[in-house]
Interface confidence: low
């Protein structure tokens, strides 16, 4: 892969260790926490990044109203089980044998159960709504400039194909970015919207995962775009299965 050959580092994932011991002396990088080889020419999967993180010593509007089936990651960090490709395994369990099913971005989509719980397939998250509130500015950002800048960010920094950025909504001070990617749309080599959203989330929090790059400096026509709150909603191809007790809580 294209890990920097001169000093052998992973441009897209600083939570790695690398050495030039791959085929032909090429740079090979492995994720902290798992030791799995990663492709440094693209984003590392969210599952491996979480595993690495856990190893190291949150009116007539044009804004989207999240569906009743939208999930928010309320469970926070956990040490996930990933498959050999670095994807989340459909069933996750903790060390006390409490298990639950997750979607492709690792967010719980069922009630918690015991080891008998079955998760037949990894359900794909095909629609992600990133809801941002920016800090007060002298005036509102120009919507088309904001739209262009955020699309550029996802295209160039996260290498997400432009067709997967479905829309950018703006109603000061709220910005919403919609990412959509069905199973049938995602081709081999395409960045997953879940991985792009996770890198963006970490960037917004000032915890960039990129090697040696400065933090995210997002500007619209030279004006800094500073985010003070982020909420991410995940919509799965198959609705989640929670008990009524949770839904009414």
């Amino acid at each position: 892969h294209t890990a920097a050959q001169d000093n052998c580092t992973c441009p897209t994932n600083k939570m790695t260790v690398c050495s030039p011991d791959g085929p032909g002396g090429r740079c090979q990088c492995r994720a902290l926490g798992s030791g799995m080889a990663v492709d440094c020419s693209t984003l590392t999967s969210k599952c491996l990044l979480l595993k690495a993180r856990m190893s190291a010593p949150k009116n007539a509007r044009t804004l989207v109203r999240p569906s009743e089936h939208a999930l928010v990651d309320n469970d926070g960090l956990y040490d996930p089980d990933c498959d050999p490709e670095g994807r989340f395994k459909a069933r996750q369990c903790n060390q006390t044998s409490v298990c639950w099913c997750v979607n492709s971005v690792g967010v719980r989509r069922t009630d918690k159960g015991d080891l008998s719980l079955r998760c037949d397939e990894l359900v794909r998250t095909h629609h992600i709504l990133i809801d941002l509130r920016h800090r007060p500015t002298a005036g509102a950002f120009n919507h088309s400039d904001l739209d262009a800048e955020l699309r550029r960010l996802f295209r160039e920094r996260y290498r997400l194909h432009p067709k997967f950025v479905a829309a950018v909504h703006y109603e000061q001070p709220t910005i919403q970015i919609e990412l959509r990617q069905n199973t049938s749309q995602k081709a081999a080599g395409d960045v997953d919207i879940g991985d792009a959203a996770y890198y963006f989330e970490r960037d917004i929090k000032g915890e960039s995962l990129f090697q040696g790059r400065g933090g995210l400096d997002l500007r619209v026509r030279g004006e800094p775009l500073q985010v003070e709150r982020t909420l991410i909603y995940y919509l799965d191809e198959i609705p989640p299965k929670f008990s009524m007790k949770r839904l009414t809580a």
């Epitope: 052998c8 260790v17 690398c18 050495s19 030039p20 011991d21 492995r30 902290l32 926490g33 798992s34 030791g35 799995m36 080889a37 595993k51 089980d81 990933c82 498959d83 050999p84 670095g86 369990c93 060390q95």
Partner: antibody, heavy 121, light 107 residues
Framework: QVQLVESGGGVVQPGRSLRVSCIAS????????MHWVRQAPGKGLEWVAV????????DYVDSVKGRFTISRDNSKNTLYLQMNSLRGEDTAMYYC??????????????WGQGTMVTVSS | DIQMTQSPSSLSASVGDRVTITCRAS??????LAWYQQKPGKVPKLLIY???TLQSGVPSRFSGSGSGTDFTLTISSLQPEDVATYYC?????????FGGGTKVEIK
């Protein structure tokens, strides 16, 4: 909690065979590469063998190649080391250790308590 | 095969002293180095992996550094419970060779 428990050690004559086992609990055994490490009395640690998480790859230290076989049964959360043609220099405490996640090469974060193998006539 | 050489083989220091143990690989191994502590009669315990990453639960007085061929384990302030033998190990590829060990005692 996460643990590894070895068994099967004992006294065996040179040239004979022995199989030691390691039962894992508290983690997804089938996701981790597993290793055997040994330590002769009063000596340092010596890596012996590795098996990939899915059993697809094995490797051994030169001194045991052709004599020892590492294997695993993921359905039983168990790691094995079959030792044939045993020699006096194989006398050691044998530890199983957890290695890389979905691989083999990584540091050993969980160790068993060890099982003693003594090769003596 | 890559050889791992530790020095010193033993040392004696006072409580509170800064202790440094070195490990040298005969060929470059990038950051693929781990440090283990083995107390008398006990099982080895992982202290540091990837040359400098502290394993969860390990006191912050332990630190690791280095890359390539030269690595260091430092105990910033030696405590009585640190009496043990310390081993380095490369883990980039087989064989996963250990260093010969450094025995640390209290004066």
């Amino acid at each position: 909690q996460v643990q590894l428990v070895e068994s099967g050690g004992g006294v065996v004559q040179p040239g004979r065979s022995l199989r030691v086992s390691c039962i894992a609990s508290g983690f997804f055994f089938s996701s981790y590469g597993m290793h055997w490490v040994r330590q002769a009395p009063g000596k340092g640690l010596e890596w012996v063998a590795v098996i990939w998480y899915d059993g697809s790859n094995e490797d051994y230290v030169d001194s045991v190649k052709g004599r020892f076989t590492i294997s695993r049964d993921n359905s039983k959360n168990t790691l094995y080391l079959q030792m044939n043609s045993l020699r006096g220099e194989d006398t050691a405490m044998y530890y199983c250790a957890r290695g890389g996640y979905n691989s083999g090469w990584w540091a050993f974060d969980i160790w068993g308590q060890g099982t003693m193998v003594t090769v003596s006539s | 095969d890559i050889q791992m050489t530790q020095s010193p083989s033993s040392l004696s220091a006072s409580v509170g002293d800064r202790v440094t143990i070195t490990c040298r690989a005969s060929q470059g191994i990038s950051h693929f180095l781990a440090w283990y502590q083995q107390k008398p009669g006990k099982v080895p315990k992982l202290l540091i992996y990837a040359a400098s990453t502290l394993q969860s639960g390990v006191p912050s007085r332990f630190s690791g550094s280095g890359s390539g061929t030269d690595f260091t384990l430092t105990i910033s302030s030696l405590q009585p419970e640190d009496v043990a033998t310390y081993y380095c190990q490369k883990f980039n590829s087989a064989p996963l060779t250990f260093g010969g060990g450094t025995k640390v005692e209290i004066k």
